[in-house]
């Protein structure tokens, strides 16, 4: 049974998760740049299912694109403090929190998402989360 | 009304120089990139470039790069496309298209100019 | 240089589907957009985002899309869908706009 030390932490992470979400979400929305809506052409894939804490190998598995996406805006004139350092946090982020012992196929919705909706989904995922631990 | 009007058809002799023009009502002309499209007679669309009207940030497609400039006056809500010295494969008909977007969504070339005809011909 | 693969042309009786496709590598990675021109006409958006309809596109309009492929699907074919259609995505890297040849519909 998880411990309420182990719950405290998992908790912070996934409040360090959701920061960084948002901070990449409000670079793309509050920059109320136009010009960046050119990275509304890349095209993100969705979990089927996202309730647990192991779906979040979805996540994992589209941090490469989202990189990708994040470095191709910076020429844009849109400024994200090291993108890689920022992805490769939630990375650590992310193993941490599925744990590396599951290896879960990750199952992705036939809808396919913009950046923004991708981003929402997974800030309305760790929300949801925190309120259970909470 | 959201609209582009473009100029009227040209007749040009090779080597001369010409300037088109494509005119937005009824949006923001400074938040929307504008593209041009060219239509060679009985053939399909080809994507030449792209601007920003605010910044005059602007794209070009690698096929027309040194054979145009894509140009905008925010002023005039004007966007333009012009050669400094046309040749006969320059014969075509030249559409400005805009980029539309919503809050997480892009809409794609969402509006068309009526099209200018350029015919070059000695 | 990126490309997009449309069929040349595609022939159809009224009141029956016109499937027509179009193949390029990035196309996993970026939506992509369909285009209706009708002779003398300039192109009109029928698809955006590879599946969503703009208002006052007919229902019978509809897109799909599956790894490297995307496709354009019109139910019920009617005489005035006789047009050119044509696909536009972007390259990986979404700097570069591309068109795909153009399929030209024919309703026989």
């Known amino acids: 049974a998880p411990t309420s030390s182990s719950t405290k932490k998992t908790q912070l992470q996934l409040e360090h998760l959701l920061l960084d979400l948002q901070m990449i979400l409000n670079g793309i929305n509050n920059y109320k740049n136009p010009k960046l809506t050119r990275m509304l052409t890349f095209k993100f894939y969705m979990p089927k299912k996202a309730t647990e804490l192991r779906h979040l190998q979805c996540l994992e598995e589209e941090l490469k694109p989202l990189e990708e996406v994040l470095n191709l805006a910076q020429s844009k004139s849109f400024h994200l403090r090291d993108t890689k350092d920022l992805i490769s946090n939630i990375n650590v982020i992310v193993l941490e929190l599925k744990g590396s012992e599951t290896t879960l196929m990750c199952e992705y919705a036939d809808e396919t998402a913009t950046i923004v909706e991708f981003l929402n989904r997974w800030i309305t995922f760790c929300q949801s989360i925190i309120s259970t631990l909470t | 009304e959201v609209q582009l009007v473009q100029s009227g058809a040209e007749v040009k002799k090779p080597g001369e120089s010409l300037k088109i023009s494509c005119k937005g009502s009824?949006?923001?002309?400074?938040?929307?990139?504008i593209g041009w499209v060219r239509q060679m007679p009985g053939k399909g669309l080809e994507w030449m470039g792209i601007?920003?009207?605010?910044?005059?940030?602007?794209t070009y497609s690698p096929s027309f790069q040194g054979q145009v400039t894509i140009s905008a006056d925010k002023s005039i809500n004007t966007a333009y496309l012009q050669w400094s010295s046309l040749k006969a494969s320059d014969t075509a008909m030249y559409y400005c298209?805009?980029?539309?977007?919503?809050?997480?969504?892009?809409?794609?070339?969402?509006?068309w100019g009526q099209g200018t005809t350029v015919t070059v011909s000695s | 240089s990126y490309e997009l693969t449309q069929p040349p042309s595609v022939s159809v009786s009224p009141g029956q589907t016109a499937r027509i496709t179009c193949s390029g590598d990035?196309?996993?990675?970026?939506?992509a957009y369909w285009y209706q021109q009708k002779p003398g006409q300039a192109p009109m958006l029928v698809i955006y985002?590879?599946?969503e309809r703009p208002s006052g596109i007919p229902e019978r309009f509809s897109g799909s899309s599956s790894g490297t492929t995307v496709t354009l699907t019109i139910s019920g074919v009617q005489a005035e869908d006789e047009a050119d259609y044509y696909c536009?995505?972007?390259?990986?890297?979404?700097?570069?706009?591309?068109f795909g040849g153009g399929t030209k519909l024919t309703v026989l």
């Open positions: 298209a805009r980029e539309g977007f919503g809050e997480s969504i892009h809409y794609g070339l969402d509006v």
């Open positions: 009824g949006y923001s002309f400074t938040s929307y990139w």
């Open positions: 601007i920003y009207p605010g910044d005059s940030d602007t």
């Open positions: 990035a196309l996993p990675r970026q939506y």
């Open positions: 985002k590879d599946s």
């Open positions: 536009q995505s972007a390259d990986s890297s979404g700097t570069y706009v591309v």
